[in-house]
Interface confidence: medium
C-alpha cells in the first residue's frame, strides 16, 4: 500500500454568490487526519492519533495551506458561468502518493454539485473529462479560468504536487505513529444459518499498517476465493484499520476450520469457538 495524503475541499454558492467559508478535510493513509474548523479558522487534528503524528508541533502550516487552497477554490467557483439559483457546490479532491519503490503519483479531481467533471494527472499534465455535455461545458469553463490565471500555470500544479509530497514526507519522517506496527486483534464468531449450516466470521481490528491477509482454511488449506466473503479494510477512527472474512460451513465440522491471519511478517491461526 502506498502512503497517501488526500485533500478534500468544498466551497458553496447561493444564487450565484460565492459563500465566504469553505469545508476541508485531509486524510493521511486513508485515515481522517485534519479538518478545517470554520469557527476558529484553523486546521484541527482529527483524534489523538493525528495529534501524535506531529507531536506537539503547531498546525500553522496546515492552516495556511488550507486557507490558501480554499481561497483558490472560491475564485474558481466564481468563474463557473452556469451558476443558477439555489445552492451549488464545487469540490476539489487532491491526492498524492508515495509508493514502496519511492515513485510518486498525484491527481486532482473537480466535482460540481457532487458530479465529477474534470480530473488531472498532475505528473503528466493530462486532463480528463467525463463524456456528458454538462461536464464538458463546466470543464472548459474552469480550464479557461485556470489557464488565464497566471498562478495556475503548469508550474503551479507541479508546485502543488511537490508541496503535497513534501507534507506527506514530513509526516512520514517525523512520525513514529506512521512507522509503527500494531498487530490485529482477531475474533472469530459463529451464527446459525439454515439447513444445518453455520456462518463463521473472522474479524481483525485495530491493526496498522493497512496490508493484511485474512482467510479461512479447511484442514490447513485456504478455501477458494468464491466460497468466502470479505469486508473492505476500513479505518476505525483511531488511526488503525479493521476488516473481516466470513464463510458458511456444515455444522459439526467446526474443528476442521481455522481463520488464518498474516500481518507485517507475523501470522496466527484462530479456531471456530465450539
Amino acid at each position: 500500500e502506498p502512503h497517501s495524503l488526500r485533500y478534500n475541499l468544498t466551497v458553496l454558492s447561493w444564487d450565484g454568490s460565492v459563500q465566504s467559508g469553505f469545508l476541508a478535510e485531509v486524510h493521511l493513509d486513508g485515515q481522517p487526519f485534519l479538518r478545517y474548523d470554520r469557527q476558529k479558522c484553523r486546521a484541527k487534528p482529527q483524534g489523538q492519533w493525528a495529534e501524535d503524528v506531529l507531536g506537539n508541533k503547531t498546525w500553522d502550516r496546515e492552516t495556511r495551506d488550507l486557507t490558501g487552497n480554499g481561497k483558490d477554490l472560491r475564485m474558481t467557483l466564481a468563474h463557473i458561468k452556469d451558476q443558477k439559483e439555489g445552492l451549488h457546490s464545487l469540490q476539489e479532491i487532491r491526492v498524492c502518493e508515495i509508493h514502496e519503490d519511492n515513485s510518486t503519483r498525484s491527481s486532482q479531481h473537480f466535482y460540481y454539485d457532487g458530479e465529477l467533471f474534470l480530473s488531472q494527472n498532475v505528473e503528466t499534465e493530462e486532463w480528463t473529462v467525463p463524456q456528458s455535455s454538462r461536464a464538458q461545458t463546466l470543464a472548459m469553463n474552469v480550464r479557461n479560468f485556470l489557464k488565464e490565471d497566471a498562478m495556475k500555470t503548469k508550474t503551479h500544479y507541479h508546485a502543488m504536487h511537490a508541496d503535497c509530497l513534501q507534507e506527506l514526507r514530513r509526516y512520514l519522517e517525523s512520525s513514529v505513529v506512521l512507522r509503527r506496527r500494531v498487530p490485529p486483534m482477531v475474533n472469530v464468531t459463529r451464527s446459525e444459518a439454515s439447513e444445518g449450516n453455520i456462518t463463521v466470521t473472522c474479524r481483525a481490528s485495530s491493526f496498522y499498517p493497512r496490508n493484511i491477509t485474512l482467510t479461512w482454511r479447511q484442514d490447513g488449506v485456504s478455501l477458494s476465493h468464491d466460497t468466502q466473503q470479505w469486508g473492505d479494510v476500513l479505518p476505525d477512527g483511531n488511526g488503525t484499520y479493521q476488516t473481516w472474512v466470513a464463510t458458511r460451513i456444515c455444522q459439526g465440522e467446526e474443528q476442521r476450520f481455522t481463520c488464518y491471519m498474516e500481518h507485517s511478517g507475523n501470522h496466527s491461526t484462530h479456531p471456530v469457538p465450539s
Epitope: 503519483r105 480530473s119 503528466t124 499534465e125
Partner: antibody, heavy 120, light 106 residues
Framework: QVQLQQSAAELARPGASVKMSCKAS????????MHWVKQRPGQGLEWIGY????????EYNQKFKDKTTLTVDKSSTTSYMQLSSLTSDNSAVYYC?????????????WGQGTLVTVSA | QIVLTQSPAIMSASPGEKVTITCSAS?????MHWFQQKPGTSPKLWIY???KLASGVPARFSGSGSGTSHSLTISRMEAEDAATYYC?????????FGSGTKLEIK
C-alpha cells in the same frame, strides 16, 4: 491541419550517433509536448521520453536515458532526437507523437517514422 | 514501472464474431488507452481514457475496465479491423505500452 514530418531513414555504423528530426506544423509548437516512441521490426512500442518545447524540460524512460538526447528548435518548430553509441539494438523505427492537454488530444498526431539501421 | 500484459498475443476471428482483447496492469491505473496499428503505418489512437472512442472509430468498438484489468471489445468483427492493438497507460512516467495483440480475420 496538424502534421509531423520526420527525417529520412538513416544507416549508421555501430558506435556512431544519429540525429533525427520531427518538423511540426499546423499548431502552436510550444503549447504541446513532443514524445518519441521506438518500434523494433515486428515488435511492440516503447516510450522513450518527451520534451516540452516551451521550456526545454525533458522526461526520459530510464531505459533510454544514457544514450538519448531530446532537443527542440523553436524557430523552425522542429524537435530532434539524438541516439549515441549505436548498437544493433538501436535498429528500429522511431516515431514522434504530439502530447496533449485534454485526454482527447494525446498521441492523436504521429510522424510517419524514421527507420534507423545499425550495421557494420 | 508499470508493466502492461496483453492477451492473447495473436488471435483470429470470423466476420461478425465478438472479439475481446485484455490488458492487465502490474499496478492500478486510472485510465487505459488503446492504439491500432496496421503494417507499415504509424499507430492510431483508437480508444482513450478507458472507454472513449477516438474520432472516426466505428461504434462496434468499446473499451472498459478499472484498476489493473482493462479490455477492448469489438462487437462484430469486420475485415478492416484486422490489425495490431496496443494498450497504453499514462498514469506515471515512464508511459508503457502492452506487447500488442495481432488480430487476424479468418
Amino acid at each position: 491541419q496538424v502534421q509531423l514530418q520526420q527525417s529520412a531513414a538513416e544507416l549508421a555504423r555501430p558506435g556512431a550517433s544519429v540525429k533525427m528530426s520531427c518538423k511540426a506544423s499546423g499548431y502552436t509548437f510550444t503549447s504541446y509536448t513532443m514524445h518519441w516512441v521506438k518500434q523494433r521490426p515486428g515488435q511492440g512500442l516503447e516510450w522513450i521520453g518527451y520534451i516540452n518545447p516551451s521550456s526545454g524540460y525533458t522526461e526520459y524512460n530510464q531505459k533510454f536515458k544514457d544514450k538519448t538526447t531530446l532537443t527542440v528548435d523553436k524557430s523552425s518548430t522542429t524537435s530532434y532526437m539524438q541516439l549515441s553509441s549505436l548498437t544493433s539494438d538501436n535498429s528500429a523505427v522511431y516515431y514522434c507523437a504530439r502530447g496533449g492537454d485534454w485526454d482527447v488530444d494525446w498521441f492523436v498526431y504521429w510522424g510517419q517514422g524514421t527507420l534507423v539501421t545499425v550495421s557494420a | 514501472q508499470i508493466v502492461l500484459t496483453q492477451s492473447p498475443a495473436i488471435m483470429s476471428a470470423s466476420p461478425g464474431e465478438k472479439v475481446t482483447i485484455t490488458c492487465s496492469a502490474s499496478s492500478s491505473i486510472s485510465y487505459m488507452h488503446w492504439f491500432q496499428q496496421k503494417p507499415g503505418t504509424s499507430p492510431k489512437l483508437w480508444i482513450y481514457s478507458t472507454s472513449k472512442l477516438a474520432s472516426g472509430v466505428p461504434a462496434r468498438f468499446s473499451g472498459s475496465g478499472s484498476g489493473t484489468s482493462h479490455s477492448l471489445t469489438i462487437s462484430r468483427m469486420e475485415a478492416e479491423d484486422a490489425a495490431t492493438y496496443y494498450c497504453q497507460h499514462r498514469s506515471t512516467y515512464p508511459f508503457t505500452f502492452g506487447s500488442g495483440t495481432k488480430l487476424e480475420i479468418k
